[in-house]
Interface confidence: medium
């Protein structure tokens, strides 16, 4: 069970990292900035 939980959270972490990498590639420094609106 613990393996399953670890795998699930690691998979989530990998997805988050992939999204961050994508955002950094598309947005550069903007990704860390305040000029962002909904």
């Amino acid at each position: 069970h613990s393996d399953g939980i670890f795998t699930d959270s690691y998979s989530r972490y990998r997805k988050q990292m992939a999204v961050k990498k994508y955002l950094a590639a598309v947005l550069g420094k903007r990704y860390k900035q305040r000029v962002k609106n909904k």
């Epitope: 598309v26 550069g28 962002k36 609106n37 909904k38």
Partner: antibody, heavy 126, light 114 residues
Framework: QSLEESGGDLVKPGASLTLTCKAS????????MCWVRQAPGKGLEWIAC????????TYYASWAKGRFTISKTSSTTVTLQMTSLTAADTATYFC????????????????????WGPGTLVTVSS | DVVMTQTPSPVSAAVGGTVTINCRAS??????LAWYQQKPGQPPKLLIS???TLESGVSSRFKGSGSGTEFILTISDLECADAATYYC????????????????FGGGTEVVVK
């Protein structure tokens, strides 16, 4: 699709002036409308931007804070109010659009301008 | 804040020739760079964004290249209509909390066509 500025004039030092930017064929929608100026024979100087979506967030160059105010007055009009004008404010004032980058539901500034108006000349002289 | 420095003006070449305009950033801006063309009495016109992406309707004679801190705008097969001042602009935003990314223009480079 075009932008057109108006309101430029010859004014005395210390005066106030409001410039207007009117869009035709472009509805302001989740982009950034900005003002950029150019003193005679000089380069480009950014003044301010406003997000045209519901937040209406405004952004100013550090030197422009307090003396310049950018506003969205309708779905196709943005204004720039200028106070305490000096000779150093003599320039052509351009209205320009930053079309924004949409990512995951957020609109980030693109930090470049794809549409410009022809400009309006402001001369400050006694 | 990022400071953009351009080739001193003017740069000149004959009709049919090639000119290169250099733009240097004071820090790494990856490929976040735009180029504008401005003719006397007219507003700037966006030519290129993201270092090399040509805007719609812009001639393929204009080519942007570079990355990091060094960028080049090359205009080939020069025409009289290319006589103008060219500005680069960092479009990476600002790492400073007290400024924004819109103000990082180069000083401009005038191109004279002989």
């Amino acid at each position: 699709q075009s932008l057109e500025e108006s309101g430029g004039d010859l004014v005395k030092p210390g005066a106030s002036l409001t410039l207007t930017c009117k869009a035709s064929g472009i509805a302001f929608s989740n982009d950034y409308m900005c003002w950029v100026r150019q003193a005679p024979g000089k380069g480009l100087e950014w003044i301010a931007c406003i997000f045209t979506g519901s937040s209406g967030s405004t952004y100013y160059a550090s030197w422009a804070k307090g003396r310049f105010t950018i506003s969205k007055t309708s779905s196709t009009t943005v204004t720039l109010q200028m106070t305490s004008l000096t000779a150093a404010d003599t320039a052509t004032y351009f209205c320009a659009r930053d079309r924004a980058i949409s990512v995951l539901g957020y609109f980030y500034a693109a930090y470049f301008f794809d549409f410009w108006g022809p400009g309006t000349l402001v001369t400050v002289s006694s | 804040d990022v400071v953009m420095t351009q080739t001193p003006s003017p740069v000149s070449a004959a009709v049919g020739g090639t000119v290169t305009i250099n733009c240097r950033a004071s820090e790494d801006i990856e490929s976040f760079l735009a180029w504008y063309q401005q003719k006397p009495g007219q507003p700037p016109k966006l030519l290129i964004s993201r270092t090399s992406t040509l805007e719609s309707g812009v001639s393929s004679r204009f080519k942007g290249s570079g990355s990091g801190t060094e960028f080049i705008l090359t205009i080939s097969d020069l025409e009289c209509a290319d006589a103008a001042t060219y500005y680069c602009q960092c479009t990476d935003g600002s790492s400073s909390s007290s400024s924004y990314g819109w103000d990082a223009f180069g000083g401009g480079t005038e191109v004279v066509v002989k």
